[in-house]
Interface confidence: medium
């Protein structure tokens, strides 16, 4: 229903908490160096007229859409063009090119520090103090990084932050508290900003009918109980959800997000019998846990797929005339039936019946044709799951660190061209795939590893589309979402590559390197095992593991030493001579 | 929801004709079987006809009914017909047009248990 006043309609609708947090989120994620203070000011502007506006709808401006609102709110800021650059070009657009042209605009890998971390005393005493700025900030530092993230998640992942803090800051140790509890948020938020990304890249590049072919075959896993018709108004919902979100329409994607939570929960008896814990929970809580409740148990008495979709006579009759909704079927009936496997598998193997459908049923005698579709899935079936067998067993073997150096290696053979610290973040990402899904009961696995995988590939893709350098990644980055990562498992050493000169000074370490965090020594580390297999690619596991073991036993020797830097500037090097004998 | 609505009933003379038409509200109703039941003043609701999902699908009908009635279904209008002629005044009833929730291609049922999605009803009277 259309109303006279749309951020009136949203704020009533949201609520003043949500509704300004959400307007954060959007203008974070527009203009990402701005400032918290300057965006919180913008955001009470907003708020400010939107009650106007509840107040009388009437009122002058309340007509307009929120884009037009919003966009004349960030144009009006001053010096634009000095910090942003082209960007300021979008202003001298109309809507709605303006705001296509803002998230044209949107960095997926922007020149900001790392969020830190403060002390946790330093903290808690700003948290107490207002916790309303402490969670302000939090939401304009995650969105400014991440300008694709799921704004009602983050919502949902800001409340979980201060749910923590107010638990922890009430302890006598509050560091052992906060540390592994939003360490846990942390890994949690970044899983869901790349899932997110695959969901507007898939928008983005293909179109809502590529984004609700997913959905359909996720959902159908999920609730394999509930009927076609259901699974496809769902889907529908949940493109419309993302699409508004992935386009910037933040308001809008929360409020029918909202909508599609209370939707579910009024019709469980039709969606599935696993959904009342969720809905028991308040609203942020609801939507969160219902996006990844469990699967439904899968009725017993399902015929087998092929009578519809292979022996029926009228396959290409049916095929013919609804070639959309007859696919979608064949993809619900196919996905409700195999929670086991990937979504990225199940539209591979819809893609192979459709591509079947329309070779057969152009020849003679299309039943003999397509009589063996099923049976050519099997090739499709198996190589990802021989991917996760391998993987998982060299998880095992190797831990999560010398798993994320395999992959590094694997990876930087098959893109050189690629710069170091992109191939280290991609590495230590899809390595992290073994500890979250390698511990995961056996029909787990693949779903878990297959749409991971695919999600952190997709940042390769988006990061190297910015600067293209590798032929290996652009033709993986350039064929459809879901043979992606087919694609680059089957890349092999580019041997195209020239290999890069040695430089001594790229192994030359100083003391500093022994103070810094765990994590960070990984980083150095990997970066130097990165920048050894560019200048040796096709150097050999054993040659690879000898010099990481040297490096490994100088840092040790020198990181314990009396003297460290002098330690460092005669033993190092020792160890780079060291290792371009080895790697001769 | 899948929202069914009937339409074409009224007061026709036997061996005259009607043709009911069943309009549902989303495109998926094409994936489903769909049937026409009937139920008349003190008696229970029966099956009348069925058809599969797609033209030119699996028809089926109730002996009654068998060579009088015709079921068809316009998919680009979401729409099903029931085509009635040489009517009776023991056809009178309330015609109800369902839509299965069954296996999606799958053949239509005569069971009403196995329609979830119901419309209203139109009332068909057959005067002697």
């Known amino acids: 229903e259309a109303h006279k006043s749309e951020i009136a309609h949203r704020y009533n609708d949201l609520g003043e908490q949500h509704f300004k947090g959400l307007v954060l989120i959007a203008f974070s994620q527009y203009l990402q160096k701005c400032s918290y203070d300057e965006h919180a000011k913008l955001v009470q502007e907003v708020t400010d007229f939107a009650k106007t506006c509840v107040a009388d709808e009437s009122a002058a401006n309340c007509d307009k859409s929120l884009h037009t609102l919003f966009g004349d709110k960030l144009c009006a800021i001053p010096n634009l063009r000095e910090n942003y650059g082209e960007l300021a070009d979008c202003c001298t657009k109309q809507e709605p090119e303006r705001n296509e042209c803002f998230l044209q605009h949107k960095d997926d890998n922007p020149s900001l520090p790392p969020f830190e971390r403060p002390e946790a005393e330093a903290m808690c005493t700003s948290f107490k103090e207002n916790p309303t700025t402490f969670m302000g900030h939090y939401l304009h530092e995650v969105a400014r990084r991440h300008p694709y993230f799921y704004a009602p998640e983050l919502l949902y992942y800001a409340e979980q932050y201060n749910e923590i803090l107010t638990q922890c800051c009430a302890e006598a140790d509050k560091e052992s508290c906060l540390t592994p509890k939003l360490d846990g948020v942390k890994e949690k938020a970044l899983v869901s900003s790349v899932r997110q990304r695959m969901k507007c890249s898939s928008m983005q590049k293909f179109g809502e009918r590529a984004f609700k072919a997913w959905a359909v075959a996720r959902l159908s896993q999920t609730f394999p109980n509930a009927d076609f018709a259901e699974i496809t108004k769902l889907a529908t919902d949940l493109t419309k959800v993302n699409k508004e979100c992935c386009h910037g329409d933040l308001l809008e994607c929360a409020d029918d997000r909202a909508e599609l939570a209370k939707y579910m929960c009024e019709n469980q008896a039709t969606i599935s019998s696993k959904l009342q814990t969720c809905c028991d929970k308040p609203l942020l809580k609801k939507a969160h846990c219902l996006s990844e409740v469990e699967h439904d148990t899968m009725p017993a008495d399902l015929p087998a797929i092929a009578a519809d979709f292979v022996e029926d006579q009228e396959v290409c009759k049916n095929y013919a005339e609804a070639k959309d909704v007859f696919l979608g079927t064949f993809l619900y009936e196919y996905s409700r039936r195999h929670p086991d496997y990937s979504v990225s598998l199940l539209l591979r193997l819809a893609k192979k019946y459709e591509a079947t459908l329309e070779k057969c049923c152009a020849e003679a005698n299309p039943p003999a044709c397509y009589g063996t579709v099923l049976a050519e899935f099997q090739p499709l079936v198996e190589e990802p799951k021989n991917l996760v067998k391998t993987n998982c067993d060299l998880y095992e073997k190797l831990g999560e660190y010398g798993f994320q150096n395999a992959i590094l290696v694997r990876y930087t053979q098959k893109a050189p061209q690629v710069s170091t610290p992109t191939l280290v973040e991609a590495a230590r990402n899809l390595g992290r795939v073994g500890t979250k899904c390698c511990t995961l009961p056996e029909d787990q696995r693949l779903p878990c590893v297959e749409d991971y995988l695919s999600a952190i590939l997709n940042r390769v893709c988006l990061l190297h589309e910015k600067t293209p350098v590798s032929e290996h990644v652009t033709k993986c980055c350039s064929g459809s979402l879901v043979e992606r990562r087919p694609c680059f498992s089957a890349l092999t050493v580019d041997e195209t590559y020239v290999p890069k000169e040695f430089k001594a000074e790229t192994f030359t370490f100083h003391s500093d390197i022994c103070t810094l965090p765990e994590k960070e020594k990984q980083i150095k580390k990997q970066t130097a095992l990165a920048e050894l297999v560019k200048h040796k690619p096709k150097a050999t596991a054993e040659q690879l593991k000898t010099v990481m073991d040297d490096f490994a036993q100088f840092l040790d020797t020198c990181c314990k030493a009396a003297d460290k830097d002098t330690c460092f500037s005669t033993e190092g090097p020792n160890l780079v001579t060291r290792c371009k004998d080895a790697l001769a | 929801q899948l929202q069914v609505v009937e339409s074409g009933g009224g007061l026709v003379q036997a061996g005259g004709s009607l043709r009911l038409s069943c309009a549902a509200s989303?495109?998926?109703?094409?994936?489903?079987?769909m049937g026409w039941f009937r139920q008349a003043p003190e008696k229970e609701r029966e099956f009348v006809a069925g058809?599969?999902?797609?033209?030119?699908?699996?028809?089926d009908y109730a002996d009654s009914v068998e060579g009088r009635f015709t079921i068809s279904r316009d998919n680009a209008k979401n729409t099903a017909y029931l085509q009635m002629n040489n009517l009776k005044p023991e056809d009178t009833a309330v015609y109800y047009c369902?839509?299965?929730?069954?296996?999606?291609?799958?053949?239509?049922?005569?069971?009403?248990?196995?329609?979830?999605?119901w419309g209203h009803g139109t009332q068909v009277t057959v005067s002697s």
């Open positions: 058809i599969s999902w797609f033209a030119g699908a699996t028809t």
């Open positions: 989303e495109r998926t109703f094409v994936a489903y079987p």
């Open positions: 369902a839509i299965s929730h069954q296996l999606p291609g799958g053949r239509p049922g005569r069971d009403m248990d196995s329609y979830s999605y």
